[in-house]
Interface confidence: medium
């Protein structure tokens, strides 16, 4: 079989070399497809103009053919969620090639030098795809091409430069640095497959954001807000790993992207939904759980291709593990009255009691301030399916249980010195489920007992009416 | 520099079980799948098996599948290679190789254990 | 399971000549692996992907071949490299070596 290394390999005029040099250049992208889920099994190495190993390694021409890209890398070998991906793409996708991009002398280099050579190593694999189209029966349109962190871009200039245009683009979580605010042409955009999704794990407002920040797909899945992911923190990592540093944590929230989309694979009974949102403040507020009008998604693999003359910028929570999916609620609470509120926020808590299971304790999240005369809209969310909602009980955090509202509870009655209870008036709560989309009223049990105060807890059950349904399409109807 | 350290020789009863272990240095554990292949006196090589440190998966050789387990502790970087049922024909040196995944070939040895199975 | 035949067994050579290793597989494999064991020691990789010098390696060595037949050259022996050489594949499970060739001083 031919040499592994073959002419797609070759450094380019891009690196600016002298010509002279550039022969003597030991060849730096390899195409591996992987012929087993194993990573022991050493696959076969495909070369642009060299039929055989296609032939000798039973590459399908008709099925779908995915290329794994990888990123900048500080080890310079492959990392363990490569191996993963591998191995669920192979199990989901039995009969489909599966090729990784080996650039690793590329990416092995100053970050900086490495966001150089994105350029070439995305023409290697426009190049490889240009001579696999020559080939009877491989289509474009079956290519699905999966880069992390600087391998999305690499993806990106790949579906720039091939002729025609690659079915799909995966970017988990592209990188930021270099690459925020750059030209679309010098980054992954929309542009460069006929369907583009992106998951962003690691994004910051403040400090350095290894991802990128900016919309650059069709869609752009922001899971947990793009930034803090759940079991990434130092404690979990200090937990987990015997060395847990800052390093751990980065290493973590920048590498859930794949894990995501590893989940999606492989847990395809458990999907988790995006929902359409403008920011990630009014997703927190609980404002934007609609699946109308394309507004909700799957993540990953299953995701519904979705060609928006805009980006669409998309959220849910997650767990901290596999599988990640968790179930989204929406609650709007009318507060008709309340007295005697001082400057302090109340703490809110419900729980959810459903005809599977029973929820935990759950915070309500107040993102800006409790409105009177006004609903105001939560999200809460549930690791477990708790099947339909029955009743819902409403806690008022008494002051003592948090030195923080202690202190302002002091204060204010410093200043007030004759303050009375304060009270809150809530008659009823309306839920809406993200992942079922339905929408249910729950009452006070007492209707003559609507207030609540700290310390206290209000019960409340489903109303007469019952469920109302919206005509409202339902996000799991819709799976495979 | 990358070392593999193994545990010292070993001498066993027919039908006892033996446990070598293989401590690793200077490179992130986790990342490197890790094989065992042994050595019968005056013989050639043989592969008995693998285990990835990251997430404990194991691949065995199916002529020792029923007698050999491989496990790891990553707390230590240690991966152990435990044969039960142990025969005079499993006398040989013991061997833990690092393979890089997706590289493709055995690039640093332990340098081996002796188990000598005599009655 | 894929079974390696090396051939010759032994090789008896003076330093300076040309060895030639040979490695013929029972089905086809997409590479082959080279190793170099001395007496008490652990194995060292010389070749990979068929035709890859390892690192550290001198270039005196180099691998060729494909399918079933596979071959190791030592352009001109040194003293160093009077040692036993193992093919190995890893193209299926288990992944199996080759019986061995001596190559000793004539």
């Known amino acids: 079989s031919p040499v592994p290394f073959g002419p797609e390999g070759r450094l380019e005029d891009k690196l600016h070399k002298p010509k002279a040099t550039q022969t003597e250049v030991k060849p730096s992208v390899r195409f591996n497809l992987r012929t087993s889920k194993d990573p022991e099994h050493e696959g076969c190495y495909l070369s642009v103009g060299h039929s055989q190993p296609l032939e000798d390694c039973s590459f399908n021409m008709t099925a779908k053919t995915f290329f794994i890209i990888h990123g900048w890398t500080m080890s310079g070998i492959f990392e363990n969620w490569l191996h993963k991906l591998v191995s669920a793409l192979h199990t989901r996708e039995k009969d489909a090639n599966v090729v990784v991009v080996d650039w690793l002398p590329l990416a092995h280099q100053l970050y900086t030098d490495a966001v150089n050579n994105t350029r070439v190593v995305g023409h290697s694999i426009a190049r490889m795809l240009d001579w696999l189209q020559e080939k009877d029966d491989f289509s474009l349109g079956n290519v699905h091409l999966i880069g992390y962190s600087l391998g999305a871009h690499v993806a990106g200039y790949a579906g720039n430069f091939v002729k025609g245009t690659v079915g799909r683009i995966t970017g988990l979580d592209p990188a930021g640095p270099m690459f925020e605010g750059a030209d679309i042409h010098k980054r992954l955009s929309p542009d460069d497959a006929d369907f583009v999704d992106v998951l962003h794990t690691y994004t910051r407002s403040f400090g350095l954001s290894i991802g990128i920040q900016m919309p650059v797909g069709h869609i752009d899945i922001y899971p947990n807000g793009g930034d803090f992911q759940p079991g990434c923190g130092l404690n979990d990592v200090l937990g987990s790993i015997a060395y847990g540093t800052i390093t751990e944590v980065v290493k973590c929230e920048h590498e859930r992207a794949v894990h995501l989309f590893v989940d999606s694979l492989v847990n395809q009974d458990k999907p988790s939904f995006a929902f359409q949102c403008t920011d990630s403040n009014r997703f927190k507020k609980g404002i934007c759980l609609s699946c109308r009008k394309n507004r909700c998604n799957s993540i990953g693999y299953n995701a519904k291709k979705m060609r928006n003359k805009r980006n669409s910028k998309m959220y849910l929570k997650t767990r901290a593990g596999m599988p990640f999916r968790v179930y989204h609620y929406q609650m709007k609470i009318h507060v008709f009255s309340y007295k005697n509120m001082g400057e302090i926020e109340p703490t809110f808590y419900v729980t959810l009691y459903g005809t599977n299971a029973d929820s935990q304790t759950l915070p309500l999240e107040i993102v800006e301030r409790i409105e009177q005369n006004a609903t105001n809209t939560f999200l809460v969310y549930t690791e477990e399916d708790l099947g339909d909602l029955l009743k819902i009980q409403l806690t008022w955090e008494g002051a003592s249980q948090s030195w923080y509202n202690l202190w302002k509870e002091f204060r204010s009655y410093l200043s007030q010195p004759r303050n009375p209870g304060r009270e809150l008036n809530i008659r009823r709560i309306r839920v809406k489920s993200g992942e079922t989309q339905r929408k249910l009223t729950f009452c006070t049990e007492d209707p003559e007992n609507t207030s609540i105060s700290p310390g206290r807890e209000l019960w409340f059950r489903k109303c007469r009416d019952g469920w109302r349904m919206k005509n409202e399409t339902s996000p799991t109807v819709e799976l495979p | 520099q990358v070392q593999l350290v193994q545990s010292g020789a070993e001498v066993k009863k027919p039908g006892a079980s033996v446990k070598v272990s293989c401590k690793a240095s200077g490179y992130t554990f986790t990342e490197y799948t890790m094989h065992w292949v042994r050595q019968a006196p005056g013989q050639g090589l043989e592969w008995m098996g693998s285990?990835?440190?990251?997430?404990?998966?194991?691949s065995y050789n199916e002529k020792f599948k029923d007698r050999v387990t491989m496990t790891r502790d990553t707390s230590t970087s240690t991966v152990y290679m435990e044969l039960s049922s142990l025969r005079s024909e499993d006398t040989a040196v013991y061997y833990c190789?690092?393979?890089?995944?997706?590289?493709?070939?055995?690039?640093?040895w332990g340098q081996g254990t002796t188990v000598t199975v005599s009655s | 399971e894929i079974v390696l035949t090396q051939s010759p067994a032994t090789l008896s050579l003076s330093p300076g000549e040309r060895a030639t290793l040979s490695c013929r597989a029972s089905s086809s494999v997409h590479y082959m692996y080279w190793y170099q064991q001395k007496p008490g020691q652990a194995p060292r990789l010389l070749i990979y992907?068929?035709?890859n010098l390892a690192p550290g390696i001198p270039a005196r060595f180099s691998g060729s071949g494909s399918g079933t037949d596979f071959t190791l050259t030592i352009s001109s022996l040194e003293p160093e490299d009077f040692a036993v050489y193992y093919c190995q594949q890893f193209t299926s499970s288990p992944y199996t070596f080759g019986g061995g060739t001596k190559v000793e001083i004539k």
């Open positions: 285990i990835n440190p990251y997430y404990g998966g194991t």
């Open positions: 992907y068929t035709s």
């Open positions: 190789a690092r393979y890089g995944n997706y590289v493709g070939y055995f690039d640093y």
